[in-house]
């Protein structure tokens, strides 16, 4: 594709190529033949992040706590605001339009991965010699006690929901 | 004082192409774009597309594009318009413009005759 | 594309009337609206680009006006040599698109 009759940073506008804005700016007047591309900085709270003719600045996200929300970044003229979750809650989209709680791992399962900001708790079943016997976003499988290291002997075997129970070594032997 | 001046007028065959040229003075020849049109007998004025001669840029209309180039010559400032496959339709005269706010200085035209 | 209809698209009239053309685009075309003489024979001039400036060397007889999607060319006093056909064209979005025009006689 041969470059269009305007450069970059540049546009076509009643046969002349004017500048376009910079990031932060919007357009007030079009360029003419006498007379440069007019702009102006964007308001408190708007932002323009490409070089552009828009005649509006966008308005900065905002980071609502009635869904959760918690500014992360503060948005500038040239950025938008960046929103996370409140602690214990992630965002239910790229766009982190709104917050969930983070979910916990039930009894037989183990947090694999802690929640962040912007991902839920991953959880993995507890594997022969693991357990975990609570509901938490927090609490990885833990490994049934080793009776033997304690010179005790396994009285009942563990599951995935419960550790093993040690005992005495039987003294009649 | 600003003139483009176009070369003489064309008959071509069908299927032909056809090259007009638009010979600009009294200007910066690079610091304004140079816009083609053209005028079928009787009609109104339909745009072809635009050239930077800076550095040769340009943008078409969809109706012509893959049929039109436009090129430009800036060591003799002149701009070149340039139809294929020509169609009886295609008749017209053409027009080349200097832009700025506007078609600010138009070229006499060239009558382009496309006929068996 | 944008279209332009341009009314009417001829009249007659008299040397010192006031002539007015009008022109309306399909959709908003931002002020980007110029105005073209055009006389048989002759090159096509400019006579007002932007809605309403007035090119160099255009009596003040001419004017422009208008926004959105509505434009008009004023001759206040129609002069022997203002007898020609009348187009306009937006400059706002590419293609480029001109009205029909509007052929001017003597009445």
């Known amino acids: 594709e041969p470059p269009t009759a305007c450069r970059e940073k540049q546009y076509l506008i009643n046969s002349q190529c004017c500048s376009l804005c910079q990031p932060g700016q919007k357009l007030v007047s079009d360029c003419t033949e006498f007379t440069e591309t007019e702009c102006l900085p964007c308001g408190e709270s708007e932002f323009l992040d490409t070089w552009n003719r828009e005649t509006h600045c966008h308005q900065h996200k905002y980071c609502d706590p009635n869904l959760g929300l918690r500014v992360q970044q503060k948005g500038t003229s040239e950025t938008d605001t960046i929103c996370t979750c409140e602690e214990g809650w992630h965002c239910t989209s790229e766009a982190c339009e709104s917050c969930v709680l983070h979910r916990s791992c039930s009894p037989g399962f183990g947090v694999k991965q802690i929640a962040t900001g912007v991902s839920d708790t991953i959880c993995e079943p507890c594997p022969v010699g693991f357990f975990s016997n609570v509901s938490s976003a927090f609490e990885k499988c833990h490994p049934w006690t080793s009776c033997e290291t304690k010179d005790l002997v396994v009285q009942q075997a563990g599951t995935n929901k419960t550790d093993v129970v040690c005992g005495p070594q039987d003294r009649l032997r | 004082q600003v003139q483009l001046v176009q070369s003489g007028a064309e008959v071509k065959k069908p299927g032909a192409s056809v090259k007009v040229s638009c010979k600009a003075s009294g200007y910066g020849f690079t610091n304004y774009l140079i816009e083609w049109v053209r005028q079928a007998p009787g009609q109104g004025l339909e745009w072809i597309g635009v050239i930077n001669p800076g550095y040769g840029g340009v943008n078409y209309n969809e109706k012509f594009k893959g049929r039109v180039t436009l090129t430009a010559d800036k060591s003799i400032s002149t701009a070149y318009m340039e139809l294929s496959r020509l169609r009886s339709d295609d008749t017209a005269v053409y027009f080349c413009?200097?832009?700025?706010?506007?078609?600010?200085?138009w070229g006499q035209g060239t009558l382009v005759t496309v006929s068996s | 594309d944008i279209q332009m209809t341009q009314s009417p698209s001829s009249l007659s009239a008299s040397v010192g009337d006031r002539v007015t053309i009008t022109c309306r685009a399909s959709?908003?075309?931002?002020?980007?609206l110029n105005w073209y003489q055009q006389k048989p024979g002759k090159a096509v001039k400019l006579l007002i680009s932007s809605t309403s400036r007035l090119h160099s060397g255009v009596p003040s007889r001419f004017s422009g006006s208008g926004s959105g999607t509505d434009y008009t060319l004023t001759i206040s006093s129609l002069q022997p040599e203002d007898f020609a056909t009348y187009f306009c064209?937006?400059?706002?979005?590419?293609?480029?698109?001109f009205g029909q025009g509007t052929k001017v006689e003597i009445k």
């Open positions: 413009a200097r832009g700025g706010s506007g078609f600010a200085f």
């Open positions: 064209q937006q400059g706002n979005t590419l293609p480029w698109t």
């Open positions: 959709q908003d075309i931002s002020n980007h």
